[in-house]
């Protein structure tokens, strides 16, 4: 049976796909689509590229690689279990029938009931997906106190402070893009 | 940096019970799912199964489903891997690996192998 | 099971030549491929992942080419760091397989 690729319910979901550009810079089409891959194009699109950039996208559904050397593997913010399901992930290579079609199955497990930690508090509803971890594994959203207006200091400081939270061995050994908004 | 630390080397009798060992360090350990991989002298490479550290729920290649027993230890970051009633067949370099990005399924980070001879 | 078979068993190879392995998969597997290589007595190192996407840390001369059922592992120059057991390894389908590897040696 075909692999399945999983997310826990209020997490992101990671749905890979990856294809090569003729060139650096030369791109190809790319539609994300909830259901399996139709004949052409994608059913209900959450996420369209074309020859330059992402062009189309809906709440929660961003690319998060590098997306200009082919890689355009889909992030899903804050799952639902009605995220669950088939996605399409179609390179539209120029020709007639050329396209690259992928099936990914989403499976969504319920969250798991743990203790909040005392030391994090909610920081995501004033910055979302503010500082993300990039390299060796998925972003990851950190939760760090609410803080009306933040700096390159006071991001600096929350770094520090990181040092104990789950996040903090991704920070040092992956680096940290930092993005705002 | 990622690492993965393996228990030693060991000798075991057949049908002795045995667990080896897989310290993980320099990441988060609940984010990326942990493998094992079985690897016999001048052969391939077998994959048994998987374990997702966050909720210690696993998946095993069928084949191995009557051999391994996968758990988690987060407190410790350690993952084990229980073999039971060993026999010559068994006799191997025993690898985990991390998962390439959380659950894609290949491996980005392998320990030093532990080797297993199942020997009377 | 999903059957991956690498081609040949052994490459014998001068050091500067450019190699090129081959590994076949018994049913379709979109671009679910990884190379690996492993030097003797040391752990699988990852090369190239989702058939053709270079790893951080590789060095560039490695590449992969390929989709569906034939993918190839290139090297444009080999050194001597290079020799070593070569594997495929597919993600599509449970469960996760790999090929028997490739030998490269020394002629």
């Known amino acids: 049976s075909e692999v399945e690729y999983r997310a826990e319910v209020g997490q992101n979901a990671y749905l890979p796909c990856f294809y090569t550009p003729a060139a650096p810079g030369n791109l190809v089409p790319v539609c994300w689509g909830k259901g399996a891959c139709p004949v052409f194009e994608c059913g209900n699109v959450v996420l369209r590229t074309d020859e330059r950039d992402v062009n189309y996208w809906t709440s929660r559904y961003w690319l998060n690689g590098d997306f200009r050397k082919g890689d355009v593997s889909l992030t899903i913010e804050n799952v639902t279990l009605a995220d669950s399901g088939i996605y399409c992930c179609r390179i539209q290579i120029p020709g007639i029938m050329n396209d690259e079609k992928f099936n990914l199955k989403l499976v969504i497990k319920p969250a798991k009931v743990t203790p909040a930690p005392t030391r994090q508090r909610d920081f995501t509803a004033a910055f979302p997906r503010m500082l993300t971890t990039r390299g060796h594994g998925p972003a990851e959203t950190q939760t760090l106190g609410s803080l009306p207006d933040i700096n390159l200091t006071q991001i600096s400081t929350l770094a520090n402070e990181l040092r104990d939270s789950r996040l903090a061995n991704d920070l040092r050994d992956s680096g940290a893009t930092i993005r705002i908004g | 940096q990622v690492q993965l630390q393996q228990s030693g080397p060991q000798l075991v009798r057949p049908g002795a019970s045995v667990q080896i060992s897989c310290k993980a360090s320099g990441y988060s350990f609940t984010s990326y799912l942990l493998h094992w991989l079985k690897q016999r002298p001048g052969q391939g490479l077998e994959w048994i199964g998987m374990i997702d550290p966050s909720d210690s729920e696993t998946r095993l290649n069928q084949k191995f489903k009557d051999k391994a027993t996968l758990t988690v230890d987060k407190s410790s970051s350690t993952a084990y891997m229980q073999l039971s009633s060993p026999t010559s067949e068994d006799s191997a370099v025993y690898y985990c690996a991390r998962d390439g990005y959380y659950a894609w399924y290949y491996f980005d980070c392998w320990g030093q192998g532990t080797t297993l001879t199942v020997s009377s | 099971d999903i059957v991956l078979t690498q081609s040949p068993a052994t490459l014998s190879v001068t050091p500067g030549d450019r190699v090129s392995l081959s590994c076949r998969a018994s049913?379709?597997?979109?671009?679910?491929l990884h190379w690996y290589q492993q030097k003797s007595h040391e752990s699988p190192r990852l090369l190239i992942k989702y058939a053709s996407h270079s790893i951080s840390g590789i060095p560039s001369k490695f590449s992969g080419t390929g989709s569906g059922t034939d993918f190839t592992l290139s090297f444009n120059s080999v050194e001597t760091e290079d020799f070593g057991m070569y594997f495929c390894q597919q993600s599509n389908s449970w469960p996760l397989t790999f090929g028997a590897g490739t030998k490269l040696e020394l002629k």
């Open positions: 049913q379709s597997i979109g671009n679910n």
